[in-house]
Amino acid sequence: QRLPRMQEDSPLGGGSSGEDDPLGEEDLPSEEDSPREEDPPGEEDLPGEEDLPGEEDLPEVKPKSEEEGSLKLEDLPTVEAPGDPQEPQNNAHRDKEGDDQSHWRYGGDPPWPRVSPACAGRFQSPVDIRPQLAAFCPALRPLELLGFQLPPLPELRLRNNGHSVQLTLPPGLEMALGPGREYRALQLHLHWGAAGRPGSEHTVEGHRFPAEIHVVHLSTAFARVDEALGRPGGLAVLAAFLEEGPEENSAYEQLLSRLEEIAEEGSETQVPGLDISALLPSDFSRYFQYEGSLTTPPCAQGVIWTVFNQTVMLSAKQLHTLSDTLWGPGDSRLQLNFRATQPLNGRVIEASFPAGVDSSPRAAEPVQLNSCLAAGD
């Protein structure tokens, strides 16, 4: 049995993690601050040793090597990473069958559909979330996280893969979207902008936030990421918006304080384990959910996106550190690593709470145009 994360009935707009409603002043993406369609961020970066075909780094589940001990990880991603493999850290999916998939970038050639045809699919991510049009779905229960409070050892690999900064997670972090919808966390990574320019991937009524965290999960129904790619619900991503607040965020500081060590593309370091759940909002009960894709090549569809309604607050200095420390390919700063929002093409975004009712400063009157499609979940 899992224990749902404790809900601390925090008042709307309150809580140490940030505001309850991630809506702000209109900030419609401009041509310059939304990278071109062909430039997904180092999203769904799945753990990897080197940039792998897609997902920046898609972990591969392999049996544990004898040297790393007698652990039985038949269905957990493992890694034989240089440095501190400390144990199975999710390993990169190294098949080079998509040869070009590791050669993509934001805002330039080659066009992403040429890198991976799935990037031209009809149900892509990220998307613009319009709370007024979201379908309230009472069947969407609070998310459950188990084992996300990591001890300092084993240490975790923090890597600049040229598209994002990615933290590879060890086995044992379990997440449930609901009964029978169980996942294991593989890695997390961030998307950001540049000085004075926001860089979240998802937007809310056109408003782009300063940054966004993605925690990528593999369904327990699959042993390997490559088996799950493109399968409905095979992968699930928890996403949260990062906003500027008055205080330093101590959880994020454990990662941000190490970015200088990995300023160079392809570099990595080891960081002590930390409470991964502290990087997410505290309210696990209010979120938006829809089916989309990885936001970087291979842009595989069938990914369940869960976007928290509450935001996470970082200090201005921390947001600056995030956007101004890392370097990407070709002596260019690693900035604006987000993909433009993609059309819904008929998809309905579901909400675990009545988002269309007084949850937005722009909500003139309650409207709920769409009905919940998952009533029986």
Epitope: L3, E68, G69, L73, L146, G147, E155, P171, G172
Partner: antibody, heavy 118, light 108 residues
Framework: EVQLVESGGGVVQPGRSLRLSCAAS????????MHWVRQAPGKGLEWVSA????????YYADSVKGRFTISRDNAKNTLYLQMNSLRAEDTAVYYC???????????WGQGTLVTVSS | QPGLTQPPSVSVAPGQTARITCGGD??????VHWYQQRPGQAPILVIR???DRPSGIPERFSGSSSVNTATLIISRVEAGDEADYYC???????????FGPGTKVTAL
């Protein structure tokens, strides 16, 4: 085969010092965090200290903080525990153990007995 | 720092099932590891992450977890299973690795 062998235990008077060693073999030592765990005679297990693979991060139980120092020599595949200002309550079998996948300890050495007595 | 609770002893007839509990506030949110320590020997990890069994550990050993209790289950108990069993978690509030007091399993 992964092997951990502790040494350096013995009888020591209160207030004195002792250094324990743990020789590791059968795995890439520098890639793993390591721990010291102790067990007083007839009692349960108590975590004492831990160190990251590079040696850059160290952690201590409150009961030994300021008195014990954990270190490692990756060139020699050896883990150390320098114990100063020893007390009678530090009497125990001291085990070294490798940091396991998600926060546990696996495998363990056979242990070395430290007796603090006047 | 918050403690874990275990029964001091569990007695079971050979061939029967032994259940050893480990109680702790919200232990269901933590990763629980179990160790077996036979008399005069070093501990060995028998269950990691609540229910995963390291290779070399018999299938008779399994684990489960609920809100405030984790359980180590030993099916078809054998004489060789007589040992002390300890649960262990990482406590993020005290920043310590914490062991339970241990349970002595006796095959009657």
């Amino acid at each position: 085969e992964v092997q951990l062998v502790e040494s350096g235990g013995g009888v020591v008077q209160p207030g004195r010092s002792l250094r324990l060693s743990c020789a590791a073999s059968g795995f890439t030592f520098s890639s793993y965090g390591m721990h010291w765990v102790r067990q007083a005679p007839g009692k349960g297990l108590e975590w004492v200290s831990a160190i990251s693979g590079s040696g850059g991060s160290t952690y201590y139980a409150d009961s030994v903080k300021g008195r014990f120092t954990i270190s490692r020599d990756n060139a020699k595949n050896t883990l150390y525990l320098q114990m100063n200002s020893l007390r009678a309550e530090d009497t125990a079998v001291y085990y070294c153990a490798r940091a396991a996948v998600t926060g546990g300890f696996d495998p363990w050495g056979q242990g070395t007995l430290v007796t603090v007595s006047s | 720092q918050p403690g874990l609770t275990q029964p001091p002893s569990v007695s079971v007839a050979p061939g029967q099932t032994a259940r050893i509990t480990c109680g702790g506030d919200n232990i269901g949110r933590k990763s629980v590891h179990w160790y077996q320590q036979r008399p005069g020997q070093a501990p060995i990890l028998v269950i990691r992450d609540d229910r995963d069994r390291p290779s070399g550990i018999p299938e008779r050993f399994s684990g489960s977890s609920s809100v405030n209790t984790a359980t180590l289950i030993i099916s078809r108990v054998e004489a060789g299973d007589e040992a002390d069993y300890y649960c262990q978690v990482w406590d993020s509030s005290s920043k310590h690795y914490v062991f339970g007091p241990g349970t002595k399993v006796t095959a009657l």
